[in-house]
């Protein structure tokens, strides 16, 4: 009897298996999340497993199908959108991806009142963006770079803009650089809260240099893809913001919103638009040298039918130690008085925190404080403010949801999530219904993800929305690697790391080490999240130790760490990876003759520089779609951190920080360079230049290109990529196939 548990344990161990590469490539252990599509304070829509669109009422506990899978299938719909008056649903089909967020699609409007598709005045195709007004069933859409308005789905459209032109003028949608580096959306139009006005951006790319690359396809001659793409120091898009009255669009036509004088005096960006009321709007602007941001609150003047942005309603945010904001400048969340707002920015100690601005930024009231950071404001109601932070137990890679009672004085703070499922859940996001009556919590780990529904008043859990039971069962016989998150203290710098260890890890043995690096400004790799991915397989099956390290330049640990890389990209990020590797060697279980590093995108840049650091630490490494010179990358991103590539600014460091400048140092490492030829983001040019420099230096290296693949190397290329990288690493580490 005493021995039995041991026998059971042994037999269990025998039935358990390591992860295989096939598991990873097939997505066998992928998880599901549940984000309710809120349509009121107590109702949400969700697409069921059999593709019916179901409306759930939390208070009555009832649910009913508003749109059948038959209707969805009749137009091959892959997405839907219910009009706020619940009379119509748009169905989206023929999805065709463009860039990261943008895509075109065909849209059909289904009339719920008569159970038929709307006939007459059908929408043109393909449409670049379409959305309902926040109230009723007006439609705004972008077709061929112009904006159209429909009072109702069956009505003829009203054309708002006429100057839209492919690759020249973009109305209501961003150009490449604004989509990728500023707005992070596929749209650039915004309805006012009750649908009275429609604001939109116009981007003029006429003078922007064009990146051109071949798309090989299947034809006799390759196509050439042309994208207006401003690289560092190049001419940028010219942006203008307009607002049109959607009831009387022809009355005075689109009215331009004035740019603050201190912004308009030199090159600038528009960064975001937030409606406050139907007649008050807040615009955020940023100087091209991105350390000055201006938030401008504008009011509608009925008598002149114009938008007035008084200087007294301009709020300046300036950074003296780096760039403005984190990755982006934060957006305001307005309170019920429609003039004061809550916003995250650096406090005097250099930590990003929530501030309440009533009149001026100088008089801002700090709402949160401490040596941690507030990360996102989810919702402000009459009496509560919900936000996320990494305060709990001083782990920067966690996210918990907090509620501050702003209705009472002094405001009290409560952590909503900290103790819910403490072992399983340390990284949350949330989704709130109208007036925060209810909310969903989505936990990403470190355990198996789980989504739950909660009462917004009491925080009581109402039900589990998704707990990934099938995944849990599937993992029962899998030998998953062990994970630990710890920190290193080196020269007054805290380096957090995540280590992924083989299942039967033994500290007395020696293991090959793979560093996975991203390391870009304001990024975070060491997070308490669940993942079964390629590196999980490498630890589980191939017995490697994998480490991720957040060095200088990474986020959510204060401005000192974040802004350390300002104007000096490619220096400290690399140093900190090297420092961490040395510390890992000191731990005694790393085989120092078998250390590799790999990264993608910014991580490809860092891994390349680390391999070429001349330390002799790395035996081999992989760079996937790396940046090789900051002169080749997008202006908005690059200049934020590096300034301009001009003699009187920062040209010297632009030149010093290239991978090509270190070509000679690759001689003593095995280097695998990988890139997609149709990468619209980090152009193939980057790898082409690395390869040229290595050839010119007569340095041997390995390379793989993926024809017609973009920065994501998706589809069959993904399988080929990870198989190829696995072979490379196993060869490097002398592991048998």
């Amino acid at each position: 009897i005493v021995l039995r548990p041991s026998r059971v344990h042994n037999s269990e161990e025998n039935t358990m298996r390591a992860l295989t590469l096939k598991d990873i490539l097939n997505g066998t252990f992928s998880y599901k999340t549940f984000f309710p599509n809120w349509i009121s304070g107590q109702e949400y829509l969700h697409q069921s497993a059999d593709n019916n669109i179901v409306l759930y009422n939390i208070e009555t506990g009832q649910s009913y199908t508003i749109l059948s899978n038959r209707t969805m299938k009749s137009v091959n719909a892959s997405n839907y959108g219910l009009s706020p008056d619940r009379q119509f649903v748009y169905l989206e089909s023929d999805y065709s991806k463009l860039w990261r967020y943008s895509y075109t699609a065909t849209y059909y409007i289904y009339d719920l009142s008569n159970g038929e598709f709307v006939r007459g005045n059908e929408l043109p195709r393909p449409i670049q963006y379409l959305c309902w007004s926040p109230v009723g069933s007006k439609l705004a859409y972008v077709y061929q770079n112009n904006i159209y308005l429909k009072q109702r789905p069956g009505d003829p459209p009203f054309q708002i803009t006429f100057n839209g032109r492919e690759n020249k003028i973009f109305n209501g949608i961003p150009d490449w650089v604004y989509e990728e580096e500023m707005l992070a959306t596929k749209y650039a139009l915004w309805w006012s809260p009750n649908g009275k006005f429609l604001a939109y951006a116009e981007f003029n790319d006429t003078d922007i240099p064009v990146i051109a690359y071949s798309y090989y396809g299947d034809e006799q001659y390759p196509r050439t893809i042309n994208i207006p793409y401003p690289k560092a120091g190049a001419k940028n898009p010219v942006v203008r913001i307009f607002i049109i009255d959607t009831t009387y669009p022809a009355y005075v036509g689109p009215q331009e919103v004035p740019v603050p004088a201190m912004i308009a005096s030199s090159d600038y960006y528009f960064s975001w638009l937030t409606w406050v009321t139907d007649e008050r709007v807040c615009l955020q602007w940023l100087k091209r040298v991105q350390n000055v941001s201006v938030l401008s609150i504008c009011d509608f003047r009925e008598d002149w039918q114009t938008w007035d942005c008084p200087k007294t309603q301009e709020h300046i945010e300036e950074s003296r130690t780096g760039w403005a904001g984190g990755f982006f400048v934060s957006t305001p969340v307005f309170s019920y008085d429609a003039i004061s707002y809550y916003k995250i920015f650096s406090d005097k100690d250099g930590y990003k925190h929530i501030h309440y601005i009533k009149d001026t930024v100088e008089n801002a009231i700090q709402i949160t404080s401490g040596k941690w950071e507030a990360i996102n404001i989810f919702r402000v109601t009459q009496d509560s403010l919900f936000y996320s932070s990494n305060e709990f137990e001083e782990y920067p890679g966690r996210r918990n949801i907090y509620r501050i009672s702003i209705g009472s004085y002094p405001p009290s703070k409560k952590c909503v999530t900290c103790h819910l499922r403490k072992e399983r859940c340390q990284y949350y996001t949330a989704s709130f219904s109208d007036y925060a009556k209810y909310y969903a919590l989505v936990c990403y780990g470190p355990g198996i993800p789980i989504s739950t529904l909660h009462d917004g008043r009491t925080d009581q859990e109402i039900k589990i929305l998704e707990e990934n039971k099938e995944l849990e069962n599937a993992l029962k016989n899998i030998q998953l690697p062990k994970e630990e998150i710890k920190k290193l203290e080196v020269d007054e710098i805290t380096l957090w790391y995540k280590m992924i260890l083989p299942p039967q890890f033994d500290r007395s043995k020696k293991y090959p080490l793979l560093i996975q690096v991203y390391g870009g400004p304001c990024s975070q790799s060491v997070r308490s999240v669940f993942a079964v991915n390629w590196i999980s397989y490498l630890a589980s099956k191939e017995g490697m130790v994998i480490a991720l390290v957040d060095g200088r330049g990474t986020a959510f640990q204060g401005d000192k760490l974040l802004y350390a890389v300002y104007r000096k990209l490619g220096v400290y990020e690399v140093e900190d990876q090297i420092t961490a590797v040395r510390k890992f060697i000191e731990m005694g279980f790393i085989d120092e003759k078998r250390i590799a590093i790999w990264g993608w995108s910014y991580g490809g840049y860092v891994s390349s520089l680390a391999l070429a650091s001349g330390t002799g630490l790395f035996k081999c490494g992989i760079a996937v779609a790396p940046v090789s010179s900051w002169e080749y990358y997008a202006s908005v991103y690059t200049e934020r951190f590096m300034g301009l590539p001009t003699k009187d600014d920062n040209l010297e460091h632009y030149k010093n920080s290239t991978v090509m400048a270190r070509a000679e140092y690759f001689r003593n490492v095995d280097y695998l360079l990988i890139h997609g030829t149709a990468d619209d983001n980090v152009h193939f040019q980057n790898s082409a230049q690395i390869a040229k420099a290595l050839v010119n230096a007569q340095v041997d290296f390995q390379a793989m290109w993926y024809s017609d693949q973009n920065h994501g190397l998706s589809g069959l290329s993904t399988n080929h990529l990870y198989t190829h990288m696995t072979h490379f690493l196993k060869q490097c580490f002398s592991l048998s196939d």
Partner: antibody, heavy 118, light 107 residues
Amino acid sequence: EVQLVESGGGLVQPGGSLRLSCAASGFTFRGYIMSWVRQAPGKGLEWVSWISPEGSRTGYADSVKGRFTISRDNSKNTLYLQMNSLRAEDTAVYYCARLQYGTWFDYWGQGTLVTVSS
Amino acid sequence: DIQMTQSPSSLSASVGDRVTITCRASQSISSYLNWYQQKPGKAPKLLIYAASSLQSGVPSRFSGSGSGTDFTLTISSLQPEDFATYYCQQATLLLPTFGQGTKVEIK
């Protein structure tokens, strides 16, 4: 099917009053700008007045300003035109029309004749 | 107010003819120009909106063009049912005004 049906026309003496009605059906009345357009016998079309979807904003031609009042009852899907201080030159067929986007008249009623004569 | 001037005020044409009516605004009205057809004793009917968009159900022989101040209505091949009076109309500043009309008669 969109339908607009005017009523209330007739013979009235100069200086008199008349109230025209327009019953709307076949569309979401409360969502549209509505308008009155008139046509004097043998003449062209002349816009008279418009009213916003919720009824808070109105517009009038100079020729009727201060004498005519446009209104609507969204619960009854009905548009009205109150005509006071009528003059001989107000004699016309009065059409009720939907003013799409405040820009074009996409649906018209059959019209009602108003005759101002002593 | 913006004045709309139509020309000609009347024209005679035969079935199958290509007919062109022009409309000039006293100042720029962008593309906010519409065309209507009216037959005796009937209400006007919208043909073209926003200078060039064909109203649903209107035959494709009708087309519109122009922007700014000069606009054109074209009937590519006149049909018997097309003999009527045609009006242009603008609506900037929420003050709609009509042209004086063009009567198309049988030659």
